[in-house]
């Protein structure tokens, strides 16, 4: 028979990149085990990641359901074998995580550029439109589909020869710049979603610069 | 075939200890949970605990607690539930019952065929 | 722990009518409940989980359905091979429980 009480877990927190969420916790159990439950503000508790020695938890399945919902997740400590509880009067001990609004918090992937193309004094950079786990009629929706206008780019770029950088700004996933015929040039896109509080940017692109083996077409 | 064959029935002296087996074959033992749940005579179900055959982690009803100990041997791909301090209450039908997969993690899709255990004086 | 409350705890019916059993959490446990059946001397077989996911080779006349705390099971057109207890169990909060069961026999 163990000696060691059971603990609550501490430190909930929510990683999201594009829809993929994960709940993290601490610490890391010793004779005990963990469940998970989320729910929306109004919505019922549901049970993942059962009795697991795990100290993270994939809800993506249940927060892609509506990412516009509010959610709340907690997670519950059991003893793990003949170990005794804290819980008082058989209550289990749990935490409560920080509220979580996917539409509004989940991270922007960092984008990447899907062509390039120069036709004399005009460059067109076409940003790749990345699929999210959120579904619709069975179908995976890019981040374009979740977000609509919402979802902007930047696009930072300057001439190989130089270091002086400019920006251009888009809502859709092209941008039409105008360059000096004849030069190369280095870019890198950033999605942004202006409207938000946190996290509004992403992480920027690989620079890609024109003129180099890759080629000025890119797919 | 996924089955789980369990071992035969037994009859124990109040206070003595009871050790039934579970042998597991047709599927990936490591790779589902197991549970075991009893039946007294002419009642219903109780479940007692869980046992991860992965890392060998239990959780038991706190009723049992203290009383029950799951182990696994995945060498056999065999678990085992060893209920002691028995008392004539514990009279009843033992199963084992595998966990489902993740789609239906905690729904008991196998199940042994019981081991039933009479304790009396 | 939570508490199901299955009724009735017995029901008498022909062949080819139509069996509803049903199963109340004593607090919300979403949709994580689950149907077996027993047959006298049997162990119990799973039909139902996840309250209305029909399990792989289960006839089609056995379904669940769910109004909040409250679960129904129905046999949709009874049949003498359908003689036996049924019994629902949830697994949203641990421990996890059964309902007391319901023993439905052919009139």
């Known amino acids: 028979s163990g000696t060691t009480n059971t603990v609550a877990a501490y430190n909930l927190t929510w990683k999201s990149t594009n829809f993929k969420t994960i709940l993290e916790w601490e610490p890391k159990p010793v004779n005990q085990v963990y469940t998970v439950q989320i729910s929306t503000k109004s919505g019922d508790w549901k049970s993942k990641c059962f009795y697991t020695t795990d100290t993270e938890c994939d809800l993506t399945d249940e927060i892609v359901k509506d990412v516009k919902q509010t959610y709340l997740a907690r997670v519950f400590s059991y003893p793990a074998g003949n170990v005794e509880s804290t819980g008082s009067a058989g209550e289990p001990l749990y935490e409560n995580s920080p509220e979580f609004t996917p539409y509004l918090e989940t991270n922007i992937g960092q984008p990447v550029i899907q062509k390039y193309e120069q036709g004399g004094t005009k460059l067109k950079v076409t940003v790749k439109d990345s699929f999210t786990l959120v579904r619709k009629n069975g179908t995976f929706l890019t981040l374009r589909q979740v977000f609509g206008n919402d979802l902007g780019y930047i696009l930072t770029y300057r001439k190989s020869s130089s270091s002086g950088k400019k920006t251009a700004k888009t809502n859709t996933n092209e941008f039409l710049i105008d360059v000096d015929k004849g030069e190369n040039y280095c870019f890198s896109v950033q999605a942004v979603i202006p409207s938000r509080t946190v996290n509004r940017k992403s992480t920027d692109s690989p620079v890609e610069c024109m003129g180099q083996e890759k080629g000025e077409f890119r797919e | 075939q996924v089955q789980l064959v369990q071992s035969g029935a037994e009859v124990k002296k109040p206070g003595a200890s009871v050790k039934v087996s579970c042998k597991a074959s047709?599927?990936?033992?490591?790779?589902?949970?197991m549970h075991w749940v009893r039946q007294a005579p002419g009642q219903g179900l109780e479940w007692m605990g869980i046992?991860?055959?992965?890392?060998?982690?239990?959780v038991y009803a706190q009723k049992f607690q203290g009383r029950v100990t799951m182990t696994r041997d995945t060498s056999t791909s065999t678990v085992y539930m060893e209920l002691s301090s028995l008392r004539s209450e514990d009279t009843a039908v033992y199963y084992c019952?595998?966990?489902?997969?993740?789609?239906?993690?905690?729904?008991?899709?196998?199940w042994g065929q019981g081991t039933m255990v009479t304790v009396s004086s | 722990d939570i508490q199901m409350t299955q009724s009735p705890s017995s029901l008498s019916a022909s062949v080819g009518d139509r069996v509803t059993i049903t199963c109340q959490a004593s607090?919300?446990?979403?949709?994580?409940l689950n149907w077996y059946q027993q047959k006298p001397g049997k162990a119990p077989k799973l039909l139902i989980y996840d309250a209305s996911n029909l399990e792989t080779g289960v006839p089609s006349r056995f379904s669940g359905s769910r109004s909040g705390t409250d679960f129904t099971f129905t046999i949709s057109s009874l049949q003498p091979e359908d003689i036996a207890t049924y019994y629902c169990q949830q697994y949203n909060f641990h421990p996890l429980t059964f309902g007391g069961g319901t023993k439905v026999e052919i009139k």
């Open positions: 047709g599927y990936t033992f490591a790779n589902y949970y």
């Open positions: 046992i991860n055959p992965s890392g060998g982690i239990t």
């Open positions: 607090q919300d446990i979403s949709n994580s």
């Open positions: 019952a595998r966990g489902g997969s993740k789609v239906a993690a905690l729904a008991f899709d196998i």
